[in-house]
Interface confidence: low
C-alpha cells in the first residue's frame, strides 16, 4: 500500500505563519551578511554625521531604477507556454522564382522570400505562433563578417531587424534569427509572398559593402549530385506554434476556471 | 522553545529512493499527457508502417540541435554572482578635453571618452568586473532613429558593439548599453583614455547619415543654471564588481573545499 | 553547481540532481512516442540542511548559505534550477507530429 | 501566475507569495544599512497538492498539473519563481558603498 509511503514526502502539514515569518527574517539576516561576506554587521563608529552624499544617492538611484535597453530578470513562463508546441518548417521559395529577378544583382545583399499560404497552413492564426526562427546554413567563411537582417516592408523599403557578427569558420554552420514578431505580422496580413534581406553591415564612413558570407541556397556552379542536399538545406523558417485544437481547448478551460 | 516548532517545517526524513523514482516516473506520465492536452495516449491504429518520413526526422533534428545565435535556456547563476557587487560609476571625460578635438565635426556620430585610471581605481582587476553599462540620457527625439555603438579600437578604427532602435519621445530617457566585455579589455590594457562612438545606422543603399538623437552632455546653448545637472547627467559607465577583498576570500574558500 | 557533472560523479547526500532515464516503452508502457525512445529526465533529491537557530554563530552559518539556502527561505527545498526542453515525434491518426515539451530535463538543482 | 497581484489580494491556501516587509531597524535591529530603510522581501508558502496514485483517473489529474506540479516532481514544493535584486547603501569605516544583492525580493512562487 502506497499510503504510508506517501507521508514520507508530504509537506502539507499545518504551518505556523508567524514561525515561518520569524525564520524567513532570521534567514535574511544571514543572507545579507553572507552576500556581503561579513561575519557580523560593520561597525558604525566612523560613519560621518548628516545625510548621505548626493553622489552616493545618485548612484543608488541609478542602480535601483531600470532603464531602457537594460534587460529585466527573466519573466515567469506564461500559462500558454506550459503546453507543447507543434514544430513545422517552411522552406524559402526557390531562387528561380520570378520574385527574385529584380533583386539579383546586388553585391551587398541576398534575398529570401516565403510563401505565406504555406505559413498559414502551418499556423492558421497569428496568436498561435510562439516562436519563429529564420535558419540559414552558412558555408565556409574566410574573414569575419558583420551582417544585418532586414524585413521587406512596402514596395522597395526594408526594415532593420537584427545583426550578427560572423566569425571565420572552416565548416558549415547553421545560423538562427528570431523572427517571431515578423512572421506574426505576415500571418495577420493579406500578402502572398513576404521576404527578408541579409546584407553586409555598412558603417557611415566605410564603403566596403560586399557580402562575403556564403549562404547555402544561393551559391552557383555546384555539381549536380549536390543539388538535392543543397535544396533541402536552403534557408527555412522553423515555426513553433500551439495547434489550433489545443488552443481552443486552452481557451475553453480558461473560461471554465 | 523553538525546537518543537522546527519539526513542523522539517522535511529531512529518511526517503526511499525507489519510491521517489516511481513517483517521478508517474508524474512524468501525467506531465507529458497534460502538456499535449491528452487525457490518454493517442490511438496507434492508423499509424503507417515503416520508419518515420525523412522530412519528419529532419524537422525533429532541427528542433533537437542547438544552433549559433539561438539563445539557450538561462544559465545557472555562477557561484561568484551569488555575492554582492559593489556599484560605482565613472563619468565621461568632459567635452572640452583635447581628445575630442579631432572628432568634433561629424554629423553622424558623437564620441565619449573615459579615463582608464578612474576605471582601474573602481575595479583594480578585470576579472572582478561582473557588469559594465554605458548609460546615456537621451533628450526629446522627434523621429525614430536607429543608432549604433562602436568601441575605439586602434588609431582611427572603430569596432561595432551593438545597436538600438530609438522610438520618438517627448521626455528624456536613460539608455543603457551592456559594455562589460569592452571595459574588461580596457582594464587589461595599458591605455590612458578609451572611448565609444554613437553613430546613426547607415544601410548600404541609404545615405541619410545624420544622428538626430540629442544626448545630454553634447548639446550646446544651454542656460547657465542647468550646467550642473547637465554635467552630472553626461554619459557614464555604471560598474558592478566584486570588491578585491571579497574576491580573495572567495578564492581561498574555493581552495579549502 | 549542483549539476549533472558534479552530482553524477559524487556521493553527495544533500540536495543534488539524481540520474533517471525514462524508457517510454519499459517505464511508461507507451509505444506512441516514436522519437526519442526515452530521455534523461533526472530529478532533484536531498536535504537542504540550513542551520537555523537564534544562538548559532553566524560565522559558521555564512559559508553554508550559498549552497544550502541562497534564497533565505524559512524551509529550503531541493528543486530544479536549469531545465531543458524535449522534442518528441508522435502520430495523430496517420499524421506525424513533432512537438517540443518545455522544462522536461533537469540539468541542475538548487536549495530554494 | 502565483504573483503579488494575485496572491496579495486573494485568500489562496495553496502555494502563493506571501507579504513580508523587512524593516532593517525594527526587524533585524540593524542601523548600518542607510538605504533603503527596509524592503518587501516576501516569501513562498502553501502546499502543492499534487494528486499521485496509481488508480487516480488521469483526466482528473491533468488539469491540476500546470498549477500544482508543472515540473513533474515526486514531491512538489512551493518555491520562488521570479526574484528581483536589492541595492543597498552602507558604510565601511568612513566610506559609503552602494552594493546590489541579487535575488532578494520574491515576486512570484511556483510549485517545483
Amino acid at each position: 500500500d502506497y499510503k504510508d509511503d506517501d507521508d514520507k514526502l508530504s509537506t502539507s502539514k499545518t504551518i505556523d505563519m508567524e514561525l515561518v515569518k520569524r525564520k524567513r527574517i532570521e534567514a535574511i539576516r544571514g543572507q545579507i551578511l553572507s552576500k556581503l561576506r561579513l561575519a557580523s554587521p560593520p561597525s558604525q563608529g566612523e560613519v560621518p554625521p548628516g545625510p548621505l552624499p548626493e553622489a552616493v544617492l545618485a548612484l543608488y538611484n541609478s542602480t535601483r531604477d531600470r532603464v531602457a535597453g537594460e534587460s529585466a530578470e527573466p519573466e515567469p513562463e506564461p500559462e500558454a507556454d506550459y503546453y507543447a508546441k507543434e514544430v513545422t518548417r517552411v522552406l524559402m521559395v526557390e531562387t528561380h522564382n520570378e520574385i527574385y529577378d529584380k533583386f539579383k544583382q546586388s553585391t551587398h545583399s541576398i534575398y529570401m522570400f516565403f510563401n505565406t499560404s504555406e505559413l498559414r497552413e502551418a499556423v492558421p492564426e497569428p496568436v498561435l505562433l510562439s516562436r519563429a526562427e529564420l535558419r540559414l546554413l552558412r558555408l565556409k567563411l574566410k574573414v569575419e563578417q558583420h551582417v544585418e537582417l532586414y524585413q521587406k516592408y512596402s514596395n522597395n523599403s526594408w526594415r532593420y531587424l537584427s545583426n550578427r557578427l560572423l566569425a571565420p569558420s572552416d565548416s558549415p554552420e547553421w545560423l538562427s534569427f528570431d523572427v517571431t514578431g515578423v512572421v506574426r505580422q505576415w500571418l495577420s496580413r493579406g500578402g502572398e509572398i513576404e521576404g527578408f534581406r541579409l546584407s553586409a553591415h555598412c558603417s557611415c564612413d566605410s564603403r566596403d559593402n560586399t557580402l562575403q558570407v556564403d549562404i547555402n541556397g544561393f551559391t552557383t556552379g555546384r555539381r549536380g549530385d549536390l543539388a538535392t542536399i543543397h535544396g533541402m538545406n536552403r534557408p527555412f523558417l522553423l515555426l513553433m506554434a500551439t495547434p489550433l485544437e489545443r488552443a481552443q481547448h486552452l481557451q475553453s478551460s480558461r473560461h471554465r476556471r | 522553545d523553538y525546537k518543537d516548532d522546527d519539526d513542523k517545517l522539517s522535511t529531512s526524513k529518511t526517503i526511499d529512493m525507489e519510491l521517489v523514482k516511481r513517483k517521478r516516473i508517474e508524474a512524468i506520465r501525467g506531465q507529458i499527457l497534460s502538456k499535449l492536452r491528452l487525457a490518454s495516449p493517442p490511438s496507434q491504429g492508423e499509424v503507417p508502417p515503416g520508419p518515420l518520413p525523412e522530412a519528419v526526422l529532419a524537422l525533429y533534428n532541427s528542433t533537437r540541435d542547438r544552433v549559433a545565435g539561438e539563445s539557450a535556456e538561462p544559465e545557472p547563476e555562477p557561484e561568484a554572482d551569488y555575492y554582492a557587487k559593489e556599484v560605482t560609476r565613472v563619468l565621461m571625460v568632459e567635452t572640452h578635453n583635447e581628445i575630442y578635438d579631432k572628432f568634433k565635426q561629424s554629423t553622424h556620430s558623437i564620441y565619449m571618452f573615459f579615463n582608464t585610471s578612474e576605471l582601474r581605481e573602481a575595479v583594480p582587476e578585470p576579472v572582478l568586473l561582473s557588469r559594465a553599462e554605458l548609460r546615456l540620457l537621451r533628450l526629446k527625439l522627434k523621429v525614430e532613429q536607429h543608432v549604433e555603438l562602436y568601441q575605439k579600437y586602434s588609431n582611427n578604427s572603430w569596432r561595432y558593439l551593438s545597436n538600438r532602435l530609438l522610438a520618438p519621445s517627448d521626455s528624456p530617457e536613460w539608455l543603457s548599453f551592456d559594455v562589460t566585455g569592452v571595459v574588461r579589455q580596457w582594464l587589461s590594457r595599458g591605455g590612458e583614455i578609451e572611448g565609444f562612438r554613437l553613430s546613426a545606422h547607415c544601410s548600404c543603399d541609404s545615405r541619410d547619415n545624420t544622428l538626430q538623437v540629442d544626448i545630454n552632455g553634447f548639446t550646446t546653448g544651454r542656460r547657465g543654471d542647468l550646467a550642473t545637472i547637465h554635467g552630472m547627467n553626461r554619459p557614464f559607465l555604471l560598474l558592478m564588481a566584486t570588491p578585491l577583498e571579497r574576491a580573495q576570500h572567495l578564492q581561498s574558500s574555493r581552495h579549502r573545499r | 553547481a549542483l549539476d549533472t557533472n558534479y552530482c553524477f560523479s559524487s556521493t553527495e547526500k544533500n540536495c543534488c540532481v539524481r540520474q533517471l532515464y525514462i524508457d517510454f516503452r519499459k517505464d511508461l508502457g507507451w509505444k506512441w512516442i516514436h522519437e526519442p525512445k526515452g530521455y534523461h529526465a533526472n530529478f532533484c533529491l536531498g536535504p537542504c540542511p540550513y542551520i537555523w537557530s537564534l544562538d548559532t554563530q553566524y560565522s559558521k552559518v555564512l559559508a553554508l548559505y550559498n549552497q544550502h539556502n541562497p534564497g533565505a527561505s524559512a524551509a529550503p527545498c531541493c528543486v530544479p534550477q536549469a531545465l531543458e526542453p524535449l522534442p518528441i515525434v508522435y502520430y495523430v491518426g496517420r499524421k506525424p507530429k513533432v512537438e517540443q515539451l518545455s522544462n522536461m530535463i533537469v540539468r541542475s538543482c538548487k536549495c530554494s | 501566475a502565483l504573483d503579488t497581484n494575485y496572491c496579495f489580494s486573494s485568500t489562496e491556501k495553496n502555494c502563493c507569495v506571501r507579504q513580508l516587509y523587512i524593516d532593517f531597524r525594527k526587524d533585524l535591529g540593524w542601523k548600518w544599512i542607510h538605504e533603503p530603510k527596509g524592503y518587501h522581501a516576501n516569501f513562498c508558502l502553501g502546499p502543492c497538492p499534487y494528486i499521485w496514485s496509481l488508480d487516480t483517473q488521469y483526466s482528473k489529474v491533468l488539469a491540476l498539473y500546470n498549477q500544482h506540479n508543472p515540473g513533474a516532481s515526486a514531491a512538489p514544493c512551493c518555491v520562488p519563481q521570479a526574484l528581483e535584486p536589492l541595492p543597498i547603501v552602507y558604510y565601511v569605516g568612513r566610506k559609503p558603498k552602494v552594493e546590489q544583492l541579487s535575488n532578494m525580493i520574491v515576486r512570484s512562487c511556483k510549485c517545483s
Epitope: R64 | D170, S171 | - | T4, Y21, D23, K26, P36, K37, G38
Partner: antibody, heavy 122, light 108 residues
Framework: QVQLVESGGGVVQPGRSLRLSCAAS????????MNWIRQPPGKGLEWIGY???????YRSNWARGRFTISRDNSKNTLYLQMNSLRAEDTAVYYC????????????????WGQGTLVTVSS | DIQMTQSPSSLSASVGDRVTITCQAS??????EAWYQQKPGQPPKLLIY???TLESGVPSRFSGSGSGTDFTLTISSLQPEDFATYYC??????????FGQGTKVEIK
C-alpha cells in the same frame, strides 16, 4: 479583514483646530505607508499627504502650513491635526493605505476608509 | 505640484457602450498614473495602477493606457454597475501626487 475607520469629524467653528484619527486593523499597520485625502461636498478628491513607516511625511503644498500628519504604531492609529480651519476645509476626510509594491510608489491608494465629515461653519 | 486635467467632466452613455476618459498631466510622469471609481456615499476604489495594470478583482472590460503626459481609461462595454465618477491620479513622487477633477458617467 483590512479595516480603516476614521473618527473625530463634526461641526467646528472657523479658526479652531481639530484632530482626526484613523484606526487600522487586519494588517501590519507599522509596515504600511498611509495617506489622508479629502473630498469637499459635490467636488473631486484632494490629496492632503502621506506618512511612511518611519514617520517621514509628505504633504501637498496647500496643506503644509496648517495640516500635520502623524502616527502611533503601538495603537495602530493614524492622525491628521488641522489648525486654523476655514469654511473651504469642509469635506469628507478619508485615510487610505498606500500600495508600495514597486519600491517608492507609496501613493497609490490601495484601500480606503469610509470617511468622516468635517463641517467648518460659524 | 503636478496638475491632472481630466476630460470630459461628465458624459452620458448606455449599457453596452464603449466609454473613453482621458487625463493629461502638466508634466511627464512616465507610467506613474492610477484610475479610481467612486459611487455616491462610498470611498473610491482602485481600478488601475502603473497606467495599464488592472487591479486584482477588477473586470477586464476596464483598461488603461498611456505614458508621459497622456492617459486613457476605457470601458469596453458599459455595465449598469459602472455608472459612477472616475478619477485619475499621478503619483511619480511625494511632491507630485494629484487627482483629476473627475468624470461623471451617467445613464443616457
Amino acid at each position: 479583514q483590512v479595516q480603516l475607520v476614521e473618527s473625530g469629524g463634526g461641526v467646528v467653528q472657523p479658526g479652531r483646530s481639530l484632530r482626526l484619527s484613523c484606526a487600522a486593523s487586519g494588517f501590519h499597520f507599522s509596515n504600511e505607508a498611509m495617506n489622508w485625502i479629502r473630498q469637499p461636498p459635490g467636488k473631486g478628491l484632494e490629496w492632503i499627504g502621506y506618512i511612511y513607516t518611519s514617520g517621514t511625511t509628505y504633504r501637498s503644498n496647500w496643506a503644509r502650513g496648517r495640516f500635520t500628519i502623524s502616527r502611533d504604531n503601538s495603537k495602530n492609529t493614524l492622525y491628521l491635526q488641522m489648525n486654523s480651519l476655514r469654511a473651504e476645509d469642509t469635506a469628507v476626510y478619508y485615510c487610505a493605505r498606500g500600495w508600495h509594491i514597486f519600491g517608492h510608489q507609496y501613493w497609490v491608494m490601495h484601500f480606503w476608509g469610509q470617511g468622516t465629515l468635517v463641517t467648518v461653519s460659524s | 505640484d503636478i496638475q491632472m486635467t481630466q476630460s470630459p467632466s461628465s458624459l452620458s452613455a448606455s449599457v453596452g457602450d464603449r466609454v473613453t476618459i482621458t487625463c493629461q498631466a502638466s508634466q511627464s510622469i512616465s507610467t506613474y498614473e492610477a484610475w479610481y471609481q467612486q459611487k455616491p456615499g462610498q470611498p473610491p476604489k482602485l481600478l488601475i495602477y502603473a497606467a495599464s495594470t488592472l487591479e486584482s478583482g477588477v473586470p477586464s472590460r476596464f483598461s488603461g493606457s498611456g505614458s508621459g503626459t497622456d492617459f486613457t481609461l476605457t470601458i469596453s462595454s458599459l455595465q449598469p454597475e459602472d455608472f459612477a465618477t472616475y478619477y485619475c491620479q499621478s503619483y511619480s513622487d511625494g511632491d507630485s501626487v494629484g487627482f483629476g477633477q473627475g468624470t461623471k458617467v451617467e445613464i443616457k
